[in-house]
């Protein structure tokens, strides 16, 4: 296992539809056909995967159908956007990319991305 | 090395509005936030909100939305704040300072002081 | 919101002696919570984040510690150039808030 350089930005703000998009960014060193990559999520010391997908190089990420993450990739970038997120969901999005094939195995784990989420304000009831 | 240079004291009238602005140089400016702070003289400090310079997006103090806005320029990497309807009670020390990775206020500006006064 | 309460608002203390200063919130925030330093005409200073870790530059006699609603910021040593305004401040969630200060003067 090599060790590989992952940037992400430190915080961003989600939208009031409680949506995130960030970019991962990753300095491969080598040419990877196959590429993982995995949103984990710290909170409290406590880390749980968001999401994961595996793709290969010049193709679309898929998460599986019930994943809230989507994303797209353009070389050693990869534009990820997390969905349905809600003040309680605010904690730090740790972008870990791992260079499958082929060999020799590299991880890198970025710093993380703080996200900070605002439950929308509820809108008042209209009468008709 | 990190810094935050505020733009200039203002004097306004009540009514008014007032734009100041906040350049920041020395790291990646869209990876960080900017928040604005205030402090009314001898009182405490008073967050107004902050914007995400990655994606615009802003959160408000409730007590001052509809007549604040926060924007950047990341081509220049300067964040503005915009308050109107200025009132007496808007004078005060404004300062940004840069949102780090636990929300900390990692660097500050030097502040821009808002005199209103009829 | 969550609202954060200081104790004391002003404290009068001799060099060298110990400074205790607490930090209180309305509901459990974990370790989101900052300490900064003003002195007179000065803008803050970020003195510890998240809850108890030092920054660079800042001198070894400050440190923070608690979590979840209680926290403190001690000051061992005091020294004359503490003489300063202390805030600390929530990130745990949105709005982000102020306590309302802790006056520190020498005597």
């Known amino acids: 296992c090599k060790a590989m350089h992952v940037a992400q930005p430190a915080v961003v703000l989600a939208s009031s539809r409680g949506i995130a998009s960030f970019v991962c960014e990753y300095a491969s060193p080598g040419k990877a056909t196959e590429v993982r990559v995995t949103v984990l999520r710290q909170a409290d010391s406590q880390v749980t995967e968001v999401c994961a997908a595996t793709y290969m190089m010049g193709n679309e990420l898929t998460f599986l159908d019930d994943s809230i993450c989507t994303g797209t990739s353009s070389g050693n970038q990869v534009n990820l956007t997390i969905q349905g997120l809600r003040a309680m969901d605010t904690g730090l999005y740790i972008c870990k990319v791992e260079l499958m094939y082929p060999p020799p195995y590299y991880l890198g784990i970025g710093n993380g991305t703080q996200i900070y989420v605002i439950d929308p304000e509820p809108c008042p009831d209209s009468d008709f | 090395q990190v810094q935050l240079v505020q733009s200039g004291a203002e004097v306004k009238k009540p009514g008014a509005s007032v734009k100041v602005s906040c350049k920041a140089s020395?790291?990646?400016?869209?990876?960080?936030?900017i928040s604005w702070v205030r402090q009314a003289p001898g009182q405490g400090l008073e967050c107004m909100g902050w914007i995400s310079a990655y994606n615009g997006n802003t959160n408000y103090a409730q007590k001052l939305q509809g007549r604040v806005t926060m924007t950047t320029d990341t081509s220049t990497s300067t964040a503005y704040m915009e308050l109107r309807s200025l009132r007496s009670d808007d004078t005060a020390v404004y300062y940004c300072a840069r949102v780090g990775r636990f929300g900390e206020f990692d660097y500050w500006g030097q502040g821009t002081l808002v005199t209103v006064s009829s | 919101e969550i609202v954060l309460t200081q104790s004391p608002d002003f404290q009068s203390v001799t060099p060298k002696e110990k400074v205790t200063i607490t930090c209180r919130a309305s509901?459990?925030?974990?370790?989101?919570l900052h300490w900064y330093q003003q002195k007179p005409d000065q803008s803050p200073k970020l003195l510890i984040k998240y809850a108890s870790q030092s920054i660079s530059g800042v001198p070894s006699r400050f440190s923070g510690s608690g979590s979840g609603t209680d926290f403190t910021l001690t000051i061992n040593s005091l020294e004359a150039e503490d003489a300063a305004a202390y805030y600390c401040h929530q990130s745990s969630s949105l709005p982000f808030t102020f306590g309302p200060g802790t006056k520190v003067d020498i005597k």
């Open positions: 020395g790291y990646t400016f869209t990876s960080y936030g």
């Open positions: 509901q459990s925030i974990g370790s989101s």
